[in-house]
């Protein structure tokens, strides 16, 4: 807290400009009107304030808006956003995607901080669902964002938003998350033809049931081993040797390199040796 002191004569700020960088902390507190600061927040980022000076500016805004900042101020916070705590952010009502983008830009290149996580949570909850534009924005800044959500949170993603998801966005998803996303993807891509459908659905197949894998095996899809390794164990185990051979096509030879890893190991163990021998790969059940 900065002690309340009268502003020295002639130092009262008429606008937010570079002259303020020479003000001591107590002078900023005494001479900068909080309402002026709020209306000229867009200028703050262009001025090289010290961290200590930014603390004073934040304090002034906190006093002016004890219930939380209005979006007109939030959108122009810039680097002052880095001074906010999750508790501060929980008071906000952020509805504009432009505001979200502006604040994510401040944190760009860094890990998702607790502040950013809180901001995103507030924004998504305010919207009621993860629409395509929001998902586009979030995954652009944080490719792992989708996989950081719980299965319950993912259930609010409408199938239409799935079009925004890139394969790399799903890299760190676990089976429970893919179980939620796969049916949405299936619905989103249902009107595509065979080969185009497979290209789109491929990254979601970690949530596919056995019957869908059996159906794909009839379509000459040539699934790569990396995709096969991400399939659900319970979906893979009932597949016959013939079905796996059709599903993988020329990639079936890759099973040998993965024979000690799940789910390949578990699948091999449950096949008849005679059937495995038809692959000519030397797999031992």
């Amino acid at each position: 807290e900065v002690e309340k002191t009268a502003c020295p004569s002639g130092k009262k700020a008429r606008e937010i400009d570079e002259s303020l960088i020479f003000y001591k902390k107590w002078e900023l507190e005494a001479c900068v009107d909080a309402a002026l600061l709020a209306t000229q927040m867009d200028r703050v980022n262009a001025i090289p304030f010290t961290y200590e000076q930014l603390d004073v500016l934040k304090h002034k805004l906190d006093e002016l808006y004890p219930q939380g900042y209005p979006e007109s101020v939030i959108q122009h916070l810039g680097y002052l956003f880095l001074k906010m705590s999750p508790e501060d952010i929980r008071k906000w009502n952020v509805t504009s995607l432009e505001t979200l983008k502006a604040l994510l830009e401040v944190n760009k290149g860094h890990e998702m901080s607790p502040q950013v996580a809180t901001l995103i949570d507030r924004f998504v909850k305010g919207r009621g669902q993860l629409d395509k534009d929001t998902l586009d924005t979030l995954t652009a800044f944080y490719p792992g964002y989708l996989c950081s959500l719980s299965p319950e949170e993912l259930s609010s993603v409408p199938p239409s938003s799935i079009w925004a998801v890139r394969p790399q966005d799903l890299d760190t998803c676990d089976p429970r998350q893919l179980d939620v996303l796969y049916p949405k993807a299936r619905l989103a891509f249902q009107n595509m033809n065979g080969s185009e459908y497979f290209v789109k659905i491929q990254s979601f197949l970690g949530g596919a049931p056995t019957e869908d894998l059996k159906a794909l095996s009839q379509q000459n899809v040539s699934m790569d081993l990396a995709t096969f390794m991400k399939l659900r164990t319970d979906a893979v185990l009932p597949l016959t040797v013939a079905e796996v051979q059709k599903l993988l096509g020329p990639h079936v030879e890759g099973l040998k390199a993965e024979e000690r890893h799940r789910p390949v190991r578990d699948w091999i163990l449950r096949q008849r040796q005679d059937d495995l021998d038809t692959l000519g790969l030397g797999l031992q059940g």
């Epitope: 319970d234 185990l237 000690r260 031992q284 059940g285």
Partner: antibody, heavy 119, light 107 residues
């Protein structure tokens, strides 16, 4: 529900073969989803997986013990067994049998049996 | 073979504390990591499988997270019955390795 019970001698002489049996009750050793493992724990130390068997007879052993380990299954008796040859004092441990459910992990364990290797 | 390194090897905590145990795999085990609790003189008990799935009958204060090489077991509010040794284990690679264990003691 499924229960496991280890049995076998508690004292084995150095260079001899340690033999233990695990009896499965309340379920079948011929389950499609499960493999059956042996795991050991030397006094005051951590857990070491020894190996598993599937009801078909397929096995998988810890590479560090592979040359000395044999695990077998008797589906008619609903049992599986461990043989560890050429034992030394370093093989003194509590030996556990456990069910490894393919979808979860070692979800059911025997209570463990202490085996001491000493002359 | 995949090696599993647990940290810390021991920790002291009080009832009500949030406790975090980490496990690092020497190479990716994807999401295939299980967590077990063992009390003195007893067999281990499965808590978490597939990195984050809670085993049936296990209290919800236990949670797991992680994928690839870094995994975490969290006890949100430590209870008297939680003082025990915890082990991670990877079933991804056929070597089925366990971590060295983390002993959670009363402060």
């Amino acid at each position: 529900q499924v229960q496991l019970q280890e049995s076998g001698p508690g004292l084995v002489k150095p260079s001899e073969t340690l033999s233990l049996t695990c009896t499965v009750s309340g379920g079948s050793v011929s389950s499609f989803t499960d493999t059956w493992s042996w795991i050991r724990q030397p006094p005051g130390k951590g857990l070491e997986w020894i190996g598993y068997i599937y009801y078909s007879g397929s096995t998988n052993y810890n590479p560090s013990l592979k040359s000395r380990v044999t695990i077998s299954v008797d589906t008619s008796k609903n049992q599986f067994s461990l043989k560890l040859s050429s034992v030394t004092a370093a093989d003194t441990a509590v030996y556990y049998c456990a069910r490894d459910n393919v979808f979860t992990g070692f979800d059911i364990w025997g209570q463990g049996t202490m085996v001491t290797v000493s002359s | 073979d995949i090696q599993m390194t647990q940290s810390p090897s021991s920790l002291s905590a009080s009832v009500g504390d949030r406790v975090t145990i980490t496990c690092r795999a020497s190479q990716s085990s994807r999401y295939y990591v299980n967590w077990y609790q063992q009390k003195p003189g007893k067999a281990p008990k499965l808590l978490i499988y597939a990195a984050s799935s809670l085993q049936s009958g296990v209290p919800s204060r236990f949670s797991g997270s992680g994928s690839g090489t870094d995994f975490t077991l969290t006890i949100s509010s430590l209870q008297p019955e939680d003082f025990a040794t915890y082990y991670c284990q990877q079933p991804y690679d056929a070597s089925y390795t366990f971590g060295g264990g983390t002993k959670v003691e009363i402060k």
